[in-house]
């Protein structure tokens, strides 16, 4: 019963990726359940812990340093067999965060992208890393990991996400490691936020008091639609930010969102989209193009929004 | 940032139970486990015990098997430590922290003064 | 259970000396010991833990060292905030156990 029916199955909540100082919980999963068992560390390294020590249903380990880094496995409680335990479980790596500077993320042709295509993620830094690892928020499965390439001082990698679906959707983060430290990984890049749009019915953009206004005018941009969307999002052409807000229902059985602009001062296009608290990086289809236009004086830009949003947080839930 | 936050002190009388909870925030409570600590006036520090949050699995060591019970609510991120049959002797501060199968306390409570008194 | 023994268990500094606290177990502990920092009124904070990890935030001044059954923490500088009882404790076996604590006080 060798490898089989005999082989726990070892895991790791919240995710195999855990931050210097953080904690994780190992489990190890034997025959339909969660029983006794003793737990391995390949390298034999930072293992006074385990030694001679059986785990009841999981195993906390925490906060962690670069020595927890590694590959491990775990035996399951097996009474009558001849050593008491079974075969060794599954090889489960833990990868520890926070080692080295961060890389940079970035998103090929842009962060906001259509269901079906394709993004590439570059992860790049001038720190010399041998490997990149991508991951994404919330995912226990092990990251993705490429070999760094190495061009005029900075090392880089690709990583081809596609074609996309909302399961694909979400809050990515990368890392560098660095030769003989394959599990020690840098701090993590700065959050990057990949939003698939186009799965929904697009809502209605409209402009109070009308799309073409006086210079210094208020301008207020409503989104609005039958669907029951929890937040709208709206962007405006050549701006990397969003603006959201939540979608309040109306008397007519609408979900509306009011984006005031606060005074006009020169025009842009604007679109908006629809989303769920359950999926908030997944879109609705753009809504059409809305153009407003400024009259009299035009000035350099338009004032900054009163609350705008980061490079990421998108996918964050709205409270 | 991470805090747990306990409950407020308690005057009982010998024979009587308590309650002690702490409310962590900051951090996924059920990806650490939690440690409970205490301390009698003037004196060091004395493990009682932990739960792992993960899991509910409670280990108590020896002195303190029996009477003292460890508890969670994950749905509110707390732990509970209840104390039975107090007696004078149980006069301490009782703190929660922060920690698992690996023994090391990274935050702790502000602490809960439980006195026992007839 | 493993007994941990603290010493001195006074220690009385000027501000700016290098001070050193020892912690001796009565079996091999290999390198699973933890160090608290207690000020007065308030809860234990973790300082060191694997003998010389340092926790989040804590001034590089403090420093952990040992192996197998003799343990140190010195803190380099000493300031005056770090008037506190510090605290030993193995985290090898369970039941965890501490040791009896070193006051510290600034003359």
């Known amino acids: 019963l060798m490898g089989g029916q005999d082989k726990p199955f070892l895991s790791a909540r919240p995710s195999t990726v855990v931050p210097r100082g953080g904690h994780v919980a190992l489990q190890c999963h034997y025959r339909r359940g969660f029983n006794n068992f003793m737990l391995y560390k390949e390298d034999r390294s930072h293992v006074p812990i385990f030694h001679g020590r059986i785990f009841q249903e999981s195993f906390i380990m925490g906060p962690v340093t670069p020595a927890h880094a590694g590959t491990y496995r775990c035996r399951g409680s097996r009474p009558h067999s001849l050593t008491g335990w079974s075969a060794p479980s599954n090889p489960l790596v833990i990868m520890v965060t926070g080692n080295h500077r961060k890389p940079s993320l970035l998103a090929h042709p842009g962060p906001l992208l259509k269901s079906g295509e394709t993004v590439i993620l570059q992860c790049w830094s001038d720190v010399m890393f041998e490997h990149f690892f991508l991951h994404r928020e919330g995912i226990s499965e092990d990251p993705s990991r490429l070999v760094g390439q190495i061009h005029d001082g900075v090392s880089k990698a690709n990583f081809s996400i596609g074609p996309l679906m909302p399961v694909l959707a979400g809050t990515y983060r990368c890392y560098g490691s660095v030769p003989h430290s394959p599990y020690q990984l840098s701090a993590p890049s700065d959050p990057l936020d990949i939003v698939i749009t186009g799965l929904y019915e697009k809502p209605s953009l409209s402009a109070q008091p009308g799309p073409t206004v006086q210079a210094g005018e208020n301008v207020t941009l409503s989104c609005s639609s039958w669907s029951s969307y929890d937040i709208y999002h709206l962007s405006r052409e050549g701006e990397a930010h969003e603006r959201r807000l939540r979608a309040v229902p109306k008397v007519n059985r609408t979900f509306q969102a009011d984006f005031p602009l606060g005074p006009a001062t020169h025009g842009g296009t604007y679109r908006c989209f629809g989303s769920f608290r359950a999926l908030p990086c997944v879109w609705s289809n753009s809504s059409d193009p809305l153009l407003v236009s400024v009259t009299g004086n035009p000035s350099s830009s338009w004032p900054s929004p009163t609350e705008p949003s980061s490079k990421s947080g998108i996918c964050r839930h709205l409270h | 940032q991470i805090q747990l936050v306990q409950s407020g002190s308690e005057l009982k009388k010998p024979g009587a139970s308590v309650k002690v909870s702490c409310k962590a925030s900051g951090y996924t409570f059920t990806t650490a486990g939690m440690q409970w600590v205490r301390q009698a006036p003037g004196q060091g520090l004395e493990w009682i015990g932990w739960?792992?949050?993960?899991?509910?699995?409670?280990k108590y060591a020896e002195d303190f098997k029996g009477r003292f019970v460890f508890s969670l609510d994950t749905s509110v991120s707390t732990a509970y430590l209840q104390i039975s049959s107090l007696k004078a002797e149980d006069t301490a501060v009782y703190f929660c922290?922060?920690?698992?199968?690996?023994?090391?306390?990274?935050?702790w409570g502000q602490g809960t003064t439980v006195t026992v008194s007839s | 259970d493993i007994v941990m023994t603290q010493s001195p268990s006074f220690l009385s500094a000027s501000v700016g000396d290098r001070v050193t606290f020892t912690c001796k177990a009565s079996q091999d502990v290999s390198t699973a010991v933890a160090w608290y920092q207690q000020k007065p009124g308030q809860s234990p904070k973790l300082l060191i833990y694997?003998?010389?990890t340092r926790h989040t935030g804590v001034p590089d001044r403090f420093s952990g060292s040992g192996s197998g059954t003799d343990y140190t923490l010195t803190i380099s500088s000493v300031q005056a905030e770090d008037v506190a009882v510090y605290y030993c404790?193995?985290?090898?076996?369970?039941?965890?156990?501490f040791g009896g604590g070193t006051k510290v006080e600034i003359k």
């Open positions: 922290a922060r920690g698992g199968d690996e023994g090391v306390m990274d935050y």
């Open positions: 739960i792992n949050s993960h899991s509910g699995v409670p």
């Open positions: 404790q193995q985290h090898y076996s369970t039941p965890w156990t």
């Open positions: 694997w003998t010389s």
